[in-house]
């Protein structure tokens, strides 16, 4: 049987080497001489020769300093043979434990740790964690028991201990109030990790803490009073630029300004934010009227895109806006004037007076009137009074110039301001009808076939309006009824049917047709009738020689 005491060897031993560890014995040595040998890692396999054994005495020796952090345990096998070389024992496993010395200082996992914390954070708020490791034995010794401390803080303001570190975990927390990004945007901490629970080997690293922004600063007007002027009637005109400063982080929602006009019930102004420099650009939202109000005193408040994190006073500014008088065009009242007038209104008589009002009540101005559009040249205007008269006869049935019984003329009024301003009015003459048009047939040229002629419909047209139109009366005159007949085509008597009484020779005929409207205004019209060499409905007319004059009735 083997006699092997537990074997441990401290790392980093000084020597001299080789150094005795233990003496191995086999109790078979009582029966005869026993020779010892070892095999395994550190003996005959790499690292070879770290351990040796005296062949005859069994003293196990170490030949060099050990490094626990490289190899913490060696597994060897001891062998015992007699002088004839026969094994007297089965091989025995030997475990050599390398005991730890505190020969490794902690190492931080990073040289620089980065963290962030909101300004104004409450004490107790975790900021970041630093971590160090130690290669020494943390199971059986305190050689790797790391304790963390903060060695320094830069800046040491507003307190030299703004942060604290959990000595066991390396978690850095806020310990004091007063973190203010606008005063101290970053802190640099030198942190230490020391083993032996803080009493041993140590190393340092840097923790850089960025204080992040909250909206704890209001935008402030500088200056707080502004003056501007704007011409009347012009929308989207820049009046003035409002300046603000905000100590929060630029180009963030906590810095970006939002402007509100506190006393603009009419929505006449608007303030937009210049995204580059945060200026407020005050503009007109709609045209202002000098004659109604010459000056506005606006109160403008400024806040941020996001709400204030803390209770802050909202900054306000006063803007005095002077409205500048501009020469405005005269305004016709009404802008569109309707006048009913009979189409037989006497030439040279006054139809109506159409005048404009001068909006510039603070300027004494003279208005001059002119006709701008009068396509039929029927009208003239008194340049001083705006009285409109006829210069020619009106005609409701002049369909080139009159639409739906309405004749449209444009009148302009010009003041004598600087620069001159011109306003336009629309005059609508509603022409009432006079029975000045007799009925006429349509068509006036008619074709019949010589054989089996088809009766032809003739429409009766009157340019006038009822009651100066249908029902119409039709009558053949000058002997036409000898060869032709007419009859009404419909109850309104707005068309007639013409047909020959007998077979007619091919040729041209003239028929006198008298048409009379409902008010007995009549007119005789000559119809041009052609009889063609065909049958039924007249198509393309192939005429024979003209009919002799005697037949043309």
């Amino acid at each position: 049987d083997w006699v092997i005491p537990p074997i441990s060897c401290p790392e980093n031993e000084k020597g001299p080497f080789p150094k005795n560890l233990v003496q191995i014995k086999s109790n078979k040595d009582k029966e005869g001489k026993v020779f010892y040998s070892i095999t395994g890692q550190g003996a005959d396999t790499p690292p070879v020769g770290v351990f040796i054994i005296e062949r005859e005495t069994g003293w196990l020796k170490v030949t060099e300093p050990l490094d626990r952090e490289r190899i913490a345990t060696y597994t060897l096998f001891s062998h015992a043979v007699s002088s004839n070389g026969n094994a007297v024992e089965d091989p025995m496993e030997i475990l050599i434990t390398v005991t730890d010395q505190n020969d490794n200082k902690p190492e931080f996992t990073q040289e620089v740790f980065k963290g962030s914390v909101m300004e104004g954070a409450l004490p107790g708020t975790s900021v970041m964690e630093v971590t160090a490791t130690d290669a020494d034995d943390d199971v059986n010794t305190y050689n790797a028991a790391i304790a963390y401390t903060i060695l320094s803080q830069d800046p040491e303001l507003p307190d030299k201990n703004m942060f604290t570190i959990n000595r066991n975990t390396g978690v850095i927390s806020v310990v004091t109030t007063g973190l203010d990004r606008e005063s101290f945007p970053t802190y640099t901490l030198v942190v230490q990790a020391a083993d032996l629970q803080g009493e041993g080997l140590s190393t340092t690293a840097t923790a850089v803490i960025t204080v992040t922004d909250t909206n704890d600063n209001p935008p402030i007007f500088n200056p707080t009073t502004y003056k501007g002027q704007v011409p009347e009637n012009e929308a989207n005109v820049v009046i003035t630029t409002l300046k603000v400063t905000d100590a929060d982080a630029p180009n963030t929602p906590a810095w970006e300004a939002v402007y509100t006009i506190l006393n603009d019930d009419g929505g006449q102004f608007v303030v937009t934010t210049n995204p580059v420099n945060n200026d407020g650009i005050l503009k007109t939202a709609k045209g202002l009227d000098f004659e109604a109000k010459q000056q506005y005193i606006l109160h403008v408040a400024v806040t941020n895109v996001v709400p204030f994190e803390v209770s802050l006073t909202t900054s306000t500014a006063t803007v005095t806006v002077d409205v500048l008088d501009v020469n405005e065009a005269p305004i016709f009242v009404p802008p569109e004037k309707r006048v009913e007038v009979s189409e037989d209104f006497g030439v040279g008589q006054e139809i109506t007076s159409y005048t404009a009002q001068e909006p510039d009540t603070f300027m004494e101005q003279k208005i001059t009137y002119r006709i701008w559009r009068d396509t039929a040249n029927w009208l003239e205007i008194n340049p001083d009074t705006g009285a409109i008269s006829t210069r020619a006869e009106l005609d409701r049935e002049d369909f080139e110039h009159v639409k739906n019984s309405t004749y449209t003329a444009l009148i302009i009024a010009t003041d004598n301001g600087s620069p001159v301003a011109t306003g336009t009015g629309t005059l609508l003459l509603i022409l009432s009808d006079v029975n000045d048009n007799a009925p006429i047939p349509e068509p006036r040229t008619i074709f019949f076939c010589e054989r089996n002629p088809k009766p032809q419909v003739i429409n009766i047209i009157d340019a006038d309006l009822p009651p100066n139109t249908s029902p119409f009366t039709a009558e053949l005159t000058h002997g036409a009824s000898a060869n032709w007949t007419i009859q009404y085509n419909d109850p309104t008597q707005e068309s007639i049917i013409l047909k020959p009484k007998m077979a007619l020779e091919v040729g041209d005929y003239k028929i006198n047709l008298k048409l009379m409207d409902n008010q007995n205004k009549d007119q005789v019209t000559t119809l041009e009738v052609s009889v063609c060499d065909c049958e039924g409905a007249a198509g393309v007319c192939r005429k024979a020689q003209p009919v002799e004059a005697g037949l043309q009735i």
Epitope: G124, V175, T177
Partner: antibody
Amino acid sequence: EVQLLESGGGLVQPGGSLRLSCAASGFTFSSYAMSWVRQAPGKGLEWVSAISGSGGSTYYADSVKGRFTISRDNSKNTLYLQMNSLRAEDTAVYYCASWGTGTLWPWGQGKMVTVSS
Amino acid sequence: QSALTQPASVSGSPGQSITISCTGTSNDVGAYNYVSWYQQHPGKAPKLILSEVNKRPSGVSNRFSGSKSGNTASLSISGLQAEDEADYYCSSFTSGLPWVLFGGGTKLTVL
């Protein structure tokens, strides 16, 4: 002299409301987090609420969350505790205290709040 | 149930020394050197007597001293006097909210 002075305590019925004030003097009030700590009769100290120096961050114990509101007016150097929906178990002496570095100091003299019908 | 554990009571005769313990965890007492002790006489507000384990504010007697080992802090009072009879509370900073933990209090009786 550094001093905190509470006011506003008294007797209130269950479900009622009360506002405590704490006037600070002798130190830069806006630089310090402030706390309310209460002590029920014959009991230990219980942390109730806290607020950062700027007033931007607040904390409430679970027992008062949703019922109590802490606020401060740095222009008046005053801390407030608005207590709504009061219960019998809210009966205690309420102290305001300033948080220095790692410790609560100074403390106010305390105000008794009694919730009883 | 308080976060930090203190004995409910201790007593001593005038002139003697006593120690009051305050036991927490590795996340509060054991993690930070921000342990404070407060003295409270009946009907009065707590008074700070030690901060940062062993720092005495001005005006506090040097008979009061503090120490810390691992997760336990201790308040020692030497040369006990009648006016030392009071309740004593420990507190510790901790990461998170609330950032202060209180002990349940210890009643000191001077016999």
